[in-house]
C-alpha cells in the first residue's frame, strides 16, 4: 500500500473512502529535461527487430494518446536485410498507469488503471537450450 | 488538454484550481487479465541485446518500485555467444506517468509526473557518419 504518516501541512481529505481516493495535480512535472526524447526515435527502423508505431487514442483516458509498437516481422532482420528464420522479433511489453475517467466523460474524476503496452521489439532466440 | 463537458452525474470539484486538480480512485483496474505477465519475462536473457533489470525504489512515488533495464553489452550477442561490436545494444525508453506525493510524505495528495524509463534493449545497426 501507500500509507505514510500524514504531515501537518498535508491537505485534509474529507472523502469517506480515504485513502482510496486522492487529489492529483494534473500540472505534469517532467523529470526528463536532461534527456532528449528524440534520441531513441529511429531505433524502430534500425533495429534487427524493427517495429511500427500505432496510435491508440481514447478520450476517456489520460494520456489520451498512447503509441503501441507492432513488430514488422516474425523473424529478425539480417545484415543483408533478409529475414533470419532462426531468430524471432518479439514485443517488449510494459505495464503502465493511466487515468480513466470515472464516471465516463467527467473532467475531474478518474480511476487509476494499469494497461499493458508494447514499447518496441527485440530479437530473441526461440529455443532455450537446457544443459543437463 | 483534457477538457470534456461535464456529465450531470459527475462529482463536483470545489478546488479553485479546477481542472488542474482532480480526484483519482487508487483502486487500480487492471485491463491485462487476458495477458500472462510472465510470458515475456525471459526475453531479457534470450535477446541478442540482453539486459539486466535494476530496482528503482522511491516511497514518495506511486508506483514506488520501477524496474529499469540496463543493456549488458555495448554490442549485440551473436549465435555463438560472442559479442558483435559492429552492432549496438540500445535501451528502448518510454515516458510513463507516475504519482509524486506533493507535499512530500502526504498520503492523499499527489502530482502527476512524467519519467523516462528503459524497458528493455534492442539491437540496432550503428549510424555511420560518412566524411565528405
Amino acid at each position: 500500500g501507500i500509507a505514510i504518516p500524514r504531515n501537518s501541512g498535508c491537505p485534509n481529505s474529507e472523502d469517506k473512502n480515504f485513502p482510496r481516493t486522492v487529489m492529483v495535480n494534473l500540472n505534469i512535472h517532467n523529470r526528463n529535461t536532461s534527456t532528449n526524447p528524440k534520441r531513441s526515435s529511429d531505433y524502430y527502423n534500425r533495429s534487427t527487430s524493427p517495429w511500427n508505431l500505432h496510435r491508440n487514442e481514447d478520450p476517456e483516458r489520460y494520456p489520451s494518446v498512447i503509441w503501441e509498437a507492432k513488430c514488422r516481422h516474425l523473424g529478425c532482420v539480417k545484415a543483408d536485410g533478409n529475414v533470419d528464420y532462426h531468430m524471432n522479433s518479439v514485443p517488449i511489453q510494459q505495464e503502465i498507469l493511466v487515468l480513466r475517467r470515472e464516471p465516463r466523460h467527467c473532467p475531474n474524476s478518474f480511476r487509476l488503471e494499469k494497461i499493458l503496452v508494447s514499447v518496441g521489439c527485440t530479437c530473441v532466440t526461440p529455443i532455450v537450450h537446457h544443459v543437463a | 488538454g483534457i477538457a470534456i463537458p461535464r456529465n450531470s452525474g459527475c462529482p463536483n470539484s470545489e478546488d479553485k484550481n479546477f481542472p488542474r486538480t482532480v480526484m483519482v480512485n487508487l483502486n487500480i483496474h487492471n485491463r491485462n487479465t487476458s495477458t500472462n505477465p510472465k510470458r515475456s519475462s525471459d526475453y531479457y536473457n534470450r535477446s541478442t541485446s540482453p539486459w539486466n533489470l535494476h530496482r528503482n525504489e522511491d516511497p514518495e512515488r506511486y508506483p514506488s518500485v520501477i524496474w529499469e533495464a540496463k543493456c549488458r553489452h555495448l554490442g549485440c550477442v551473436k549465435a555463438d555467444g560472442n559479442v558483435d561490436y559492429h552492432m549496438n545494444s540500445v535501451p528502448i525508453q518510454q515516458e510513463i506517468l507516475v504519482l509524486r506525493r506533493e507535499p512530500r510524505h502526504c498520503p492523499n495528495s499527489f502530482r502527476l509526473e512524467k519519467i523516462l524509463v528503459s524497458v528493455g534493449c534492442t539491437c540496432v545497426t550503428p549510424i555511420v557518419h560518412h566524411v565528405a
Epitope: 516481422h73 516474425l74 523473424g75 539480417k78 543483408d80 536485410g81 533478409n82 529475414v83 533470419d84 528464420y85 532462426h86 524471432n88 518479439v90 526461440p126 529455443i127 532455450v128 | 510470458r39
Partner: antibody, heavy 120, light 107 residues
C-alpha cells in the same frame, strides 16, 4: 483470384532427381514468402522448405537439407523445388503455399498439390 | 524440433455439437500457432493464425484460444461442411511443425 498450380511430380527411382514448379497468379508474387509442404499418403503435413519474398533467405529441415533446393523467379511468378538424391520416404503430395506476409511462416493459400512417388 | 501433439486424433460428433480440438507444444510457442482444415483430396485451408485471429471469410463458429504450450480450436456449432481433418502448426521455431491432425467424423 489467388491461384497456385504445382507441376513436375511423377514417378522417380531412389537416388533420382525431380524439379517441381509452382505457377502463381492473382497476387503480387514478389512480395510474399513461399513454402513447400508435403503430405505422405494418409499422413500429416511436413514443412519441406521456406523462401522469403526476394529469395534472400531460405530454410530447410534436416530431413531434406543438402538434397533439396528452393528457388523463385519473381519475373516469372514461379516457385521451384529441385529435389536430388530422392528416397522412398520423400514419397508424398507436394504443396506450394503462400505466406500472407513477406517471409513464409504460415500459409493462407495452397496449391492443389503434385504427387511425387519414389520407388524402384 | 518442437513437437505438436493434437488430441483427440479423431472424434465423432453430430451437426450442432460444440467441438473442441487441442494442440500441445513441447515448449512455449508464444501464440505463434495456426489452425488448418483439410478435406479429403484437397489442400489445407487456413482458419486461424496467431492462436486467436480468425482468417477473413472463415465462419465465426470457429475460434482459437490458448497461450504458452496449450491451444484450442473450438467449433461452436458443427455444420455438415465442417467434417474434415484439422491440423495445428507452430511457427515460433524452425522447422515449423504440424500436429498429427484431428479427424472430425459424423456420428
Amino acid at each position: 483470384e489467388v491461384q497456385l498450380v504445382e507441376s513436375g511430380g511423377g514417378l522417380v527411382q531412389p537416388g533420382g532427381s525431380l524439379r517441381l514448379s509452382c505457377a502463381a497468379s492473382g497476387f503480387t508474387f514478389s512480395t510474399y514468402g513461399m513454402s513447400w509442404v508435403r503430405q505422405a499418403p494418409g499422413k500429416g503435413l511436413e514443412l519441406v522448405s521456406i523462401i522469403n519474398h526476394n529469395g534472400g533467405s531460405t530454410f530447410y529441415p534436416d530431413s531434406v537439407k543438402g538434397r533439396f533446393t528452393i528457388s523463385r523467379d519473381n519475373s516469372k511468378n514461379t516457385l521451384y523445388l529441385q529435389m536430388n538424391s530422392l528416397r522412398a520416404e520423400d514419397t508424398a503430395v507436394y504443396y506450394c503455399a503462400r505466406d500472407p506476409r513477406h517471409d513464409g511462416y504460415f500459409f493462407d493459400y495452397w496449391g492443389q498439390g503434385t504427387l511425387v512417388t519414389v520407388s524402384s | 524440433d518442437i513437437q505438436m501433439t493434437q488430441s483427440p486424433s479423431s472424434l465423432s460428433a453430430s451437426v450442432g455439437d460444440r467441438v473442441t480440438i487441442t494442440c500441445r507444444a513441447s515448449e512455449d510457442i508464444y501464440d505463434r500457432l495456426a489452425w488448418y482444415q483439410q478435406k479429403p483430396g484437397k489442400a489445407p485451408n487456413l482458419l486461424v493464425s496467431g492462436a486467436t485471429s480468425l482468417e477473413s471469410g472463415v465462419p465465426s463458429r470457429f475460434s482459437g484460444s490458448g497461450s504458452g504450450k496449450d491451444y484450442t480450436l473450438t467449433i461452436s456449432s458443427l455444420q455438415p461442411e465442417d467434417f474434415a481433418t484439422y491440423y495445428c502448426q507452430q511457427y515460433w521455431s524452425v522447422p515449423w511443425t504440424f500436429g498429427g491432425g484431428t479427424k472430425v467424423e459424423i456420428k
